[in-house]
Amino acid sequence: EGAAQPNNSLMLQTSKENHALASSSLCMDEKQITQNYSKVLAEVNTSWPVKMATNAVLCCPPIALRNLIIITWEIILRGQPSCTKAYKKETNETKETNCTDERITWVSRPDQNSDLQIRTVAITHDGYYRCIMVTPDGNFHRGYHLQVLVTPEVTLFQNRNRTAVCKAVAGKPAAHISWIPEGDCATKQEYWSNGTVTVKSTCHWEVHNVSTVTCHVSHLTGNKSLYIELLPVPGAKKSAKLY
């Protein structure tokens, strides 16, 4: 399944790996590595939504490894001290400071590949990741505001006469719920400590010629629609149909 497109114009590359986890990357093709530093002088920051439980690969500016002196990844996660992973080419020395998450690693040996990978992205990986490449011509940066996306669990049921409840449970960010046809609706959001949000929309249809209603849940991870037939019998429950 394709991950959402980020805010900037770069498209996410998504593929299936042996262990069936999708892998997302914003990395440039090897052929695009530039010798012209002026093209990448500006610090680039990218907002990047990544689905939970996928693998993510984050890349440094496109500078040839032979021109490098040091590569540093700075990782700032909520509620944790800043983690630094550094590689000094001259001494072939790697160094880590305050890095405890074993799922965040170099893709391979940093002298061969400066990319950072997050294996099985979790909610706790929400944060800011920055690669700093030290070259004789200065330092070049690329930063990622990584937003971990969690697909909500969607349910739809009728709980009393001509009233339906649609819930998008534990999504990140909050899902948006809309109805066809529109009814008399009240929406409530419940925030969980892990950063997910449950959205509950309760709708009532007074008009008796409305027999089937559809709940449409919009989310960055994908959209889902469920419909239900409204029963006039008080207290009757009807399970939703997915289409």
């Epitope: 002196i69 040091i70 540093t72 550094a86 000094k88 001259e90 001494t91 020395e93 160094k95 030290v134 070259t135 004789p136 011509d137 200065g138 330092n139």
Partner: antibody, heavy 124, light 107 residues
């Protein structure tokens, strides 16, 4: 204790080239560290020129890259600066110096040992 | 290149006084700044690196502070041997760059 000593021509004519030598005692330059050239212009402005590391790799200041080079003679424990197409603006005191290079700190490009400096005047 | 602006250029003080020298970087250099002392007839000496770390052999009356772009070298209770030229140098990125120097003279 590590000691560095610069030597050179003193006076050079414009458009010519010159070479400076840095002799290192108390440490073998192939064993470690980075070995730099720095110059101080009249008026005290300082400019880092470049370095050669223990393995012979060089990193140069981009503003000078096209007309100078740093080399070494490992048998004599010396490293050299060659500056081409000199002008009066190259008149300066030239220093050789060694980077600190701790294993725990990566941005360690400060100079813990310096030579006394050698004056080079470019004049016709 | 990272522009380093040092001030003042000249500073006159008496032994026993305290003085401060400022160094401003043209961009964020984190804490990667060194301070040097230059005296005629002596080799240049690094006093402080990484913004505030005293180099081995530096007297404790010297201290460094700052982060990002603004840094200060403070000398408390000046000794006669402290009168010299002081330079700052950023060691965050290449090319390495120096401040223009501060000459500390006896008043």
């Amino acid at each position: 204790e590590i000691q560095l000593q610069e030597s050179g021509p003193g006076l050079v004519k414009p458009s010519q080239s010159f070479s400076l030598t840095c002799s290192v005692t108390g440490y073998t330059i192939t064993s470690g560290y980075d070995w730099s050239w720095i110059r101080k212009f009249p008026g005290n402005r300082m400019e880092w020129m470049g370095y050669i590391n223990y393995s012979g790799s060089t990193v140069y200041n981009p503003s000078l890259r096209s007309r100078f080079s740093i080399t070494r003679d490992t048998s004599k424990n010396q490293f050299f600066l060659q500056l081409n197409s000199v002008a009066s603006e190259d008149t300066a005191t030239y220093y050789c110096a060694k980077f600190e290079a701790s294993n725990t700190y990566l941005y360690d490009w400060y100079f813990d040992f310096w030579g006394p400096g050698t004056m080079v005047t470019v004049s016709s | 290149d990272v522009q380093m602006t040092q001030s003042p250029s000249y500073l006159a003080a008496s032994p026993g006084e305290s003085v401060s020298i400022s160094c401003k970087a043209g961009k964020n250099i984190n804490t990667n700044l060194a301070w040097y002392q230059a005296k005629p007839g002596k080799t240049n000496k690094v006093l402080i690196h990484s913004g505030s770390t005293l180099q081995s052999g530096t007297p404790s009356r010297f201290s460094g502070s700052g982060f990002g772009t603004d840094f200060t070298l403070t000398i408390r209770s000046l000794e006669p041997e402290d009168f010299a030229v002081y330079y700052c140098q950023q060691h965050n990125e290449f090319p390495l760059t120096f401040g223009s120097g501060t000459k500390l003279e006896i008043k």
